[in-house]
Interface confidence: low
């Protein structure tokens, strides 16, 4: 099992590698490396649980497996793990978890949470028996986590922004120092990107990485201290 996740670890220190081989697992061994941080990039995996929230492990017949963004409602699937949080795979299609059964209506299942202050449980007014043939409506104050659908960055938890991923917009992590970023050439060019990146975190700006090992033509941009 250990060998199966080796390739999903990014730039680990020798000490970290030693820890892992001794049977320890790091908090982000399953997808927290720089390589896997941006949802637009794929990285190897051997099972769904090695991918960050909002992704599943896609294993093609040929080529290497990779963590892919989860399938939304009404998209085709082969198993539950392929479907986004609060949905499951039913007859080859991702459907809301509660659509096929009569069950208490809980507005935010899974990764998002709306809980009362005292004990972290749902408030009574969130529960009520309903025939759940209709889709959930997320309450506006529930923040999206990584991979969750969004309309604007304020829909995402702190440290994440709302960015385009294929034809949808999902919460992605704000970029940290040393991470590759996208320099806006002209206003509004964000709209052309299929895999849009977040901006650099506070106190960082997206600048050309001046490194002799990279050709000047590559013009790689990286988040650097202002």
């Amino acid at each position: 099992k250990l060998n199966s996740i080796k390739s999903s670890l990014g730039g680990e220190t020798p000490g970290q590698a030693a820890n892992r081989s001794a049977g320890m697992y790091q908090g982000l061994a399953f997808g927290g490396s720089k390589k896997g941080k941006n949802l637009g990039q794929a990285y190897p995996c051997s099972s769904d649980k090695e991918c960050e929230v909002g992704r599943y492990c896609h294993s093609p017949h040929q080529g290497s497996s990779a963590c892919m963004v989860c399938r939304r409602k009404k998209k085709r699937c082969h198993r539950d793990g392929m479907c986004c949080p609060s949905t499951r795979c039913n007859n080859g299609i991702c459907i809301p978890v509660t659509e096929s059964i009569l069950t208490p209506h809980i507005p935010a299942l899974d990764g998002t949470r709306h809980r009362d202050r005292n004990h972290g449980h749902y408030s009574n007014h969130d529960l009520g028996w309903q025939n759940l043939g209709r889709p959930h409506t997320k309450m506006s104050h529930i923040k999206g986590h990584e991979g969750d659908p969004c309309l604007r960055s304020s829909d995402c938890i702190e440290g994440f922004c709302c960015a385009r991923h294929f034809w949808t917009k999902i919460c992605k992590p704000v970029l940290h120092q040393g991470e590759v970023c996208t320099k806006q050439r002209k206003k509004g060019s964000h709209g052309l990107e299929i895999f849009q990146r977040c901006d650099c975190a506070k106190g960082l700006s997206c600048k050309v990485w001046k490194d002799a090992t990279y050709s000047s033509k590559a013009r790689l941009h990286v988040c650097q201290k202002i």
């Epitope: 320890m24 790091q26 908090g27 982000l28 929230v53 994440f160 992590p173």
Partner: antibody, heavy 121, light 113 residues
């Protein structure tokens, strides 16, 4: 999200005991389930965790001969069996869900109410 | 295993006072690839289950009052309650959520004068 643990257990030394934790309100097979021990008036001790999708288990070496973790996907229930209990195993045992806190993380965001196990002859 | 050391073991404060408790880890909890510290704080009120307050050292869990502030990096971490309330009477535990085996501190008991 709710984690409902089984009731208090009074067990004889040496007689194994199986605790249960029924999960509801989320996709059971997508999250690691942790088990944590707390002896009276003491701190928290991580026993191990199990991933319901394929029953992969990671145990604290201290508990490798003591605890066996299993799941039943059909009922969204996690189990922990304690073998050959002694007075040292008298404690409250909690199940707690792995927190998907934006990034993959091993913090625990939802906890069961705890099961009190008393080992006594 | 990573050893978590909490101090003080107990403290008594009056309502409205600022409370600071410390947690030190035997090795760094900073993940250099994403600059996050894998340190969580839990509150356990008498007779109740632990409740997650803060994760990634400084991110408050939803529904947690903003008087609870987590800070620190690497091996030294602090939980501050800016203005303690009577309902904050509890044990507070830190936990590293970086590497298995996951480990907790022994706890800080907060009493209200």
């Amino acid at each position: 999200v709710k984690l409902q643990e089984s009731g208090a257990e009074l067990v004889r030394p040496g007689a194994s005991v199986k605790l249960s934790c029924k999960a509801s309100g989320y996709s059971f097979t997508n999250y690691w389930m942790n088990w944590v021990k707390q002896r009276p008036g003491q701190g928290l001790e991580w026993i191990g965790m199990i991933h319901p999708s394929d029953s992969e288990t990671r145990l604290n070496q201290k508990f490798k001969d003591k605890a066996t973790l299993t799941v039943d996907k059909s009922s969204s229930t996690a189990y922990m069996q304690l073998s050959s209990p002694t007075s040292e195993d008298s404690a409250v045992y909690y199940c707690a869900r792995e927190g998907r806190l934006g990034l993959r993380s091993y913090a625990m965001d939802y906890w069961g109410q705890g099961t009190t196990v008393t080992v006594s002859s | 295993d990573i050893v978590m050391t909490q101090s003080p073991s107990s403290l008594a404060m009056s309502v409205g006072q600022k409370v600071t408790m410390s947690c030190k880890s035997s090795q760094s909890l900073l993940n250099s690839s994403n600059q996050k510290n894998y340190l969580a704080w839990y509150q356990q009120k008498p007779g109740q289950s632990p409740k997650l307050l803060v994760y990634f050292a400084s991110t408050r869990e939803s529904g947690v009052p903003d008087r609870f502030v987590g800070s620190g990096s690497g091996t030294d971490f602090t939980l501050t309650i800016t203005s303690v309330q009577a309902e904050d009477l509890a044990d507070y535990f830190c936990q590293q959520h970086y590497i298995t085996p996951l480990t907790f501190g022994a706890g800080t008991k907060l009493e209200i004068k």
